[in-house]
């Protein structure tokens, strides 16, 4: 808490500027009033205040709004953002993704902090869904955000904005979200012809079916290893050695180097001998 | 998942009319097939027609081309057949099934090896 006390005679600040940061914390307190704060927050970021500084508009901006900051303020706040707390934040309401934007590139290149969950979920919760253009937002700032959603949230993202998903933004997905995502993509990308199909939902298989799986199998898709080995177990236990084998294409010489790891592993041991044979890769059931 | 049901069968005279219809719940997308099939008593299973879900494109076995017509509702996610002029030939069990996924039409064609979902199949019998 800053104390209380009357604004030296000639020091009330008529406007943000650089001036200010040779004043002391009770002085800002004093001689900066709040809604000049609020009105030229934009300002503050190209001032070098100090932390203690910066605490003090803090304070000044929870007075002047304590039910939460309109989003006028919000969408300035830059470095002032890094001060607020989580329960700060969930008293906003951000509805327009060019605050959420300038909040992110305030936090950018560090890892997504409370703060920032928080902000996300405010955001998302307010628009209802996840729509594409947020997706593409929160996916360039945090590669790995699609996959920190549980499944119950990623079932709130509309088939459409799975288009704006990079392979990437997949890699840390368990197949509980990829259960999710899978059938989203299947409607997104179901227009779209044989091969470019294909390259678009590869991502995703690690969702599909043994049904899929199999209809795959019968049009040389080629699958690679990678992506073979990130499919459900269930789905490729009941798939045979003549349909494994045409699912993966020339790729097929690559299950003996998995063969000790799921979903190989498994998959091996539910086939004849004689079958596992007819590959020529010496693998044992 | 898709779920396959089909209804419709029944006995009628040569010469006469039935249409087959197949409700398909589940995932139902553009990029499916889905076809009728046949068995007769002692034979095998054998294509009928086939239909390319998302563009309306369609395939007959050369026994009903002309006389067969398969067409689908998108909005009830349902497959109909509808068979004129039937023949004694044409009694058999037949059966809706679907492609979940055709990365081309042509691979739509009704061969049943490539089809991986059933329906348990509906009774259909043509008295001379």
């Known amino acids: 808490e800053v104390e209380k006390t009357a604004c030296p005679s000639g020091k009330k600040a008529r406007e943000i500027d650089e001036s200010l940061i040779f004043y002391k914390k009770w002085e800002l307190e004093a001689c900066v009033d709040a809604a000049l704060l609020a009105t030229q927050m934009d300002r503050v970021n190209a001032i070098p205040f100090t932390y203690e500084q910066l605490d003090v508009l803090k304070h000044k901006l929870d007075e002047l709004y304590p039910q939460g900051y309109p989003e006028s303020v919000i969408q300035h706040l830059g470095y002032l953002f890094l001060k607020m707390s989580p329960e700060d934040i969930r008293k906003w309401n951000v509805t327009s993704l060019e605050t959420l934007k300038a909040l992110l590139e305030v936090n950018k290149g560090h890892e997504m902090s409370p703060q920032v969950a928080t902000l996300i979920d405010r955001f998302v919760k307010g628009r209802g869904q996840l729509d594409k253009d947020t997706l593409d937002t929160l996916t360039a700032f945090y590669p790995g955000y699609l996959c920190s959603l549980s499944p119950e949230e990623l079932s709130s993202v509309p088939p459409s904005s799975i288009w704006a998903v990079r392979p990437q933004d997949l890699d840390t997905c368990d197949p509980r979200q990829l259960d999710v995502l899978y059938p989203k993509a299947r409607l997104a990308f179901q227009n779209m012809n044989g091969s470019e199909y294909f390259v678009k939902i590869q991502s995703f298989l690690g969702g599909a079916p043994t049904e899929d799986l199999k209809a795959l199998s019968q049009q040389n898709v080629s699958m690679d290893l990678a992506t073979f080995m990130k499919l459900r177990t269930d789905a490729v236990l009941p798939l045979t050695v003549a349909e494994v084998q045409k699912l993966l294409g020339p790729h097929v010489e690559g299950l003996k180097a998995e063969e000790r790891h799921r979903p190989v592993r498994d998959w091996i041991l539910r086939q004849r001998q004689d079958d596992l044979d007819t590959l020529g890769l010496g693998l044992q059931g | 998942q898709v779920k396959l049901v089909e209804s419709g069968g029944g006995s009628v005279q040569a010469g006469g009319s039935l249409r087959l219809s197949c409700a398909a719940s589940?995932?139902?997308?553009?990029?499916?097939?889905m076809g009728w099939f046949r068995q007769a008593p002692g034979k095998e299973r054998e294509g009928v027609a086939s239909i390319y879900v998302g563009g309306g494109y369609t395939n007959y076995a050369d026994s009903v081309r002309g006389r067969f017509t398969i067409s689908q509702d998108n909005a009830k996610n349902t497959l109909y057949l509808q068979m004129n002029s039937l023949k004694p030939e044409d009694t058999a069990m037949y059966y809706c099934?679907?492609?979940?996924?055709?990365?081309?039409?042509?691979?739509?064609?009704?061969?049943?090896?490539?089809?991986?979902?059933w329906g348990q199949g509906t009774q259909v019998t043509v008295s001379s």
């Open positions: 589940g995932n139902v997308y553009n990029n499916m097939c």
């Open positions: 099934a679907a492609i979940t996924v055709a990365l081309t039409r042509a691979f739509c064609a009704p061969i049943p090896s490539r089809y991986t979902n």
